[in-house]
Interface confidence: medium
Amino acid sequence: KVFGRCELAAAMKRHGLDNYRGYSLGNWVCAAKFESNFNTQATNRNTDGSTDYGILQINSRWWCNDGRTPGSRNLCNIPCSALLSSDITASVNCAKKIVSDGNGMNAWVAWRNRCKGTDVQAWIRGCRL
């Protein structure tokens, strides 16, 4: 599923991401835009043999199990394929664990490079939330 901007903002708010660990909803929507272009089925392979999955591009080396990433920790205790569902519950729950891990949203390279320090509220402007 490819979400609309406001549609995703509403879904993320429903799942409790607004101000989760101090990150406003705009940060999460911005991250999803530049990680996956709002596409729940996005997959991208990394040079270390791992793969990033879903709307927030969660990595198989640390967070989920895709059955083929050497040394996978699976800290979210889920199959990576669950992160590709049109229902973003699994991605959000795992993202909450990631953002609580110490580095905050710096764990997402796209957020760090494209969202951090910008007017992230623009990503939810005009949305009825």
């Epitope: 997959t43 059955g67 083929r68 050497p70 990576c80 394929s81 590709l84």
Partner: antibody, heavy 116, light 107 residues
């Protein structure tokens, strides 16, 4: 136990297309990548690409882009590979395998012969 | 693409001999190297994964070693059922690639 059952041998004419199937049993089909591998005598084993059945995400070896197309049907736990514009170079044994990085589970292979 | 070069191409041995098969990668692949056995008209069978981990049901006479670019599959006291082709494969990067194979034949 994990099993991959491939469709039977095919004899096709040059220019035609063929669709090979790979039915998976014994595990959660949508969760694991399915890989496709080509074997020709004297050419060893070649990785064609992969599909994640749960999402339909696909990756292809550049060499096989435009030649192979992967699909999957999660209702029947079956992955498919279509090969188009067949030539004699496509005559080979084609295997599906469960994509665990290493391939511990293989289909029995489908022999494709392309001949006029 | 990562090239895997296997040597020798053919190895002629007598049952009871111990042998080593080599696989060399064109660049470092860490420990993401796997070994397969293939007998005529059969599918490949995983022997060793991640350089040295035995696959389930594989006899203990098969072992693997190496790191980076140079890897070895060793068979301690070859049995008649071991004759066939052996392939290495890397899963360090895409596309996945296989070595050209070593044929283990009876002398």
């Amino acid at each position: 136990q994990v099993q991959l059952q491939e469709s039977g041998a095919e004899v096709m004419k040059p220019g035609a297309s063929v669709k090979i199937s790979c039915k998976a049993t014994g595990y959660t089909f949508s969760t694991y990548w399915i890989e496709w591998v080509k074997q020709r005598p004297g050419h060893g084993l070649e990785w064609i690409g992969e599909i994640l059945p749960g999402s339909g995400s696909t990756y292809y070896n550049e060499k096989f882009k435009g030649k192979a197309t992967f699909t999957a049907d999660t209702s029947s736990n079956t992955a498919y590979m279509q090969l188009s514009s067949l030539t004699s170079e496509d005559s080979a044994v084609y295997y599906c395998a469960r994509g665990d990085g290493n391939y511990g589970y293989w289909g029995q292979g489908t022999t494709l012969t392309v001949s006029s | 693409d990562i090239e895997l070069t296997q040597s020798p191409a053919t190895l002629s041995v007598t049952p009871g001999d111990s042998v080593s098969l080599s696989c060399r990668a064109s660049q470092s692949i860490s420990n993401n190297l796997h070994w397969y056995q293939q007998k005529s008209h059969e599918s490949p069978r995983l022997l060793i994964k991640y350089v040295s981990q035995s696959s389930s049901g594989i006899p203990s006479r098969f072992s693997g070693s190496g790191s980076g670019t140079d890897f070895t599959l060793s068979i301690n006291s070859v049995e008649t059922e071991d004759f066939g082709m052996y392939f290495c494969q890397q899963s360090n990067s895409w596309p996945r690639t296989f070595g050209g194979g070593t044929k283990l034949e009876i002398k």
